[in-house]
């Protein structure tokens, strides 16, 4: 048994990272194999994961973790029962992908603006907390060519746009990601789309 | 929100032991490192040591080796820090602080007077 | 006995900018992140800088942090009257056992 990839891990900055590797052939992760990992830090404990599947030789695991904060370095080592097969170091700030925002809402009750709002994932003592900047994706579900990206580079997790920049009448998803250029991030997956029915009032003309 | 709820001030006779409490609230109590440090009257911050309340481990600073003990209770969030032969140079307010690599909260500190 | 040098005391008119040095070794500072603390008188330390230049919620963007070498530095701007008070400087240390040393402190007056 080897591992043909090995283990390349992401932290959400929070409380859980998650590592995946594929093996040289079809294993069963959670009864053949153990991540082992460890803060390099006085009095940490060792703690074990035990992974799961993702297809057929994938597997991944997810590593739960205190009060992550920078300075935070961890060892990792895979094991197949008593033998050693991979032994290597993750530090989470140097491989972040944030949490997807919640809660996307669209309100459509202000005179022909849209307010779109939605949660910043984390709470406020977590650093990316007031350093989270987002895009919001709106598109038709009539026309793939209406597709649209919106960068919200301020700390307010909302954005208005006129009604009139959308087409009257049909329906709009939307929805959100997050990064944060501090720690250099990758984008977050996408926050559940919501959907919404387009409906303004034309400009009377003269 | 966090606090750290220390117990009151103590006065001592030198020899003496004393034993200051740290009652937590507000987070997960396990998953936050706490150190304890203390300040002489009109002196600076001394570090004396750091307790890992998931496992109750402790590591302290090698200046009260073997005259400073730190433990806690899981059951009511609680770390406590004893120090024992007790002399006039204790006398100081002992802090216990939330914290890994650095202190995010503190408590309100305890007074400690070790006087004959 | 303090391992981080500071200045005793440093004074600015309100207004003013004021920065507070900290000096240390390689074992600490040189191979760690810096803290600072604030302690107005009669209360507890609180955290004001940590990770060398980043501030928890709260703290006004006023106070900076900077690290160099095995020195670093805060600094605060605009001054208030009730930035009066002592700064301390904190690092951790693993050149035999961990440690987590403070610097000697700092009385910052307003004049």
């Known amino acids: 048994m080897k591992v043909l990839q090995e283990p390349t891990c992401v932290s959400d900055y929070m409380s859980i990272s998650t590592c995946e590797w594929k093996m040289n052939g079809p294993t069963n992760c959670s009864t053949e194999l153990r991540l082992l990992y460890q803060l390099v830090f006085l009095l940490s404990e060792a703690h074990t994961c035990i992974p799961e599947n993702n297809g057929g030789a994938g597997c991944v695991c997810h590593l739960l973790m205190d009060d992550v904060v920078s300075a935070d370095n961890y060892t990792l080592d895979l094991w197949a029962g008593q033998q050693l097969l991979w032994k290597g170091s993750f530090k989470p700030s140097e491989h972040v992908k944030p949490r997807a925002p919640g809660n996307l809402t669209v309100h459509t009750n202000v005179s022909d603006t849209l307010l779109l709002t939605w949660s910043n994932p984390y709470p406020p003592d977590n650093y990316l907390y007031n350093h989270l900047t987002y895009a919001v994706n709106i598109w038709s579900e009539n026309d793939p060519a209406d597709f649209r990206i919106y960068n919200v580079t301020y700390l307010e997790p909302s954005l208005r746009i006129a009604a009139s920049t959308l087409k009257s009448g049909i329906s709009y998803r939307a929805r959100v990601r997050a990064w944060a250029q501090c720690y250099n991030t990758t984008w977050s997956e996408w926050s559940p789309s919501t959907k919404w029915h387009n409906s303004y009032r034309e400009p009377f003309e003269q | 929100q966090v606090q750290l709820v220390q117990s009151g001030a103590e006065v001592k006779k030198p020899g003496a032991s004393v034993k200051v409490s740290c009652k937590a609230s507000?987070?997960?109590?396990?998953?936050?490192?706490m150190h304890w440090a203390r300040q002489a009257p009109g002196q600076g911050l001394e570090w004396m040591g750091i307790?890992?309340?998931?496992?109750?481990?402790?590591s302290y600073a090698q200046k009260f080796q073997g005259r400073v003990t730190m433990t806690r209770d899981t059951s009511t969030s609680t770390v406590y820090m004893e120090l024992s032969s007790l002399r006039s140079e204790d006398t100081a307010v002992y802090y216990c602080a939330r914290g890994k690599y650095w202190m995010y909260d503190w408590g309100k500190g305890t007074l400690v007077t070790v006087s004959s | 006995q303090s391992v981080l040098t500071q200045p005793p005391s440093v004074s600015a008119a309100p207004g003013q900018k004021v920065t507070i040095s900290c000096s240390g070794g390689s074992s600490n500072i040189g191979n760690s992140y810096v803290s600072w603390y604030q302690q107005l008188p009669g209360t507890a330390p609180k955290l004001l800088i940590y990770d060398n230049n980043k501030r928890p919620s709260g703290i006004p963007d006023r106070f900076s942090g900077s690290k160099s070498g095995t020195s670093a530095t805060l600094a605060i701007t605009g001054l208030q009257t009730g930035d009066e008070a002592d700064y301390f400087c904190g690092t951790w240390d693993t050149s035999t056992v961990w440690e987590w040393p403070f610097g000697t402190g700092t009385k910052l007056t307003v004049l």
């Open positions: 307790i890992n309340p998931s496992g109750g481990s402790a």
């Open positions: 507000g987070y997960a109590f396990t998953s936050y490192y």
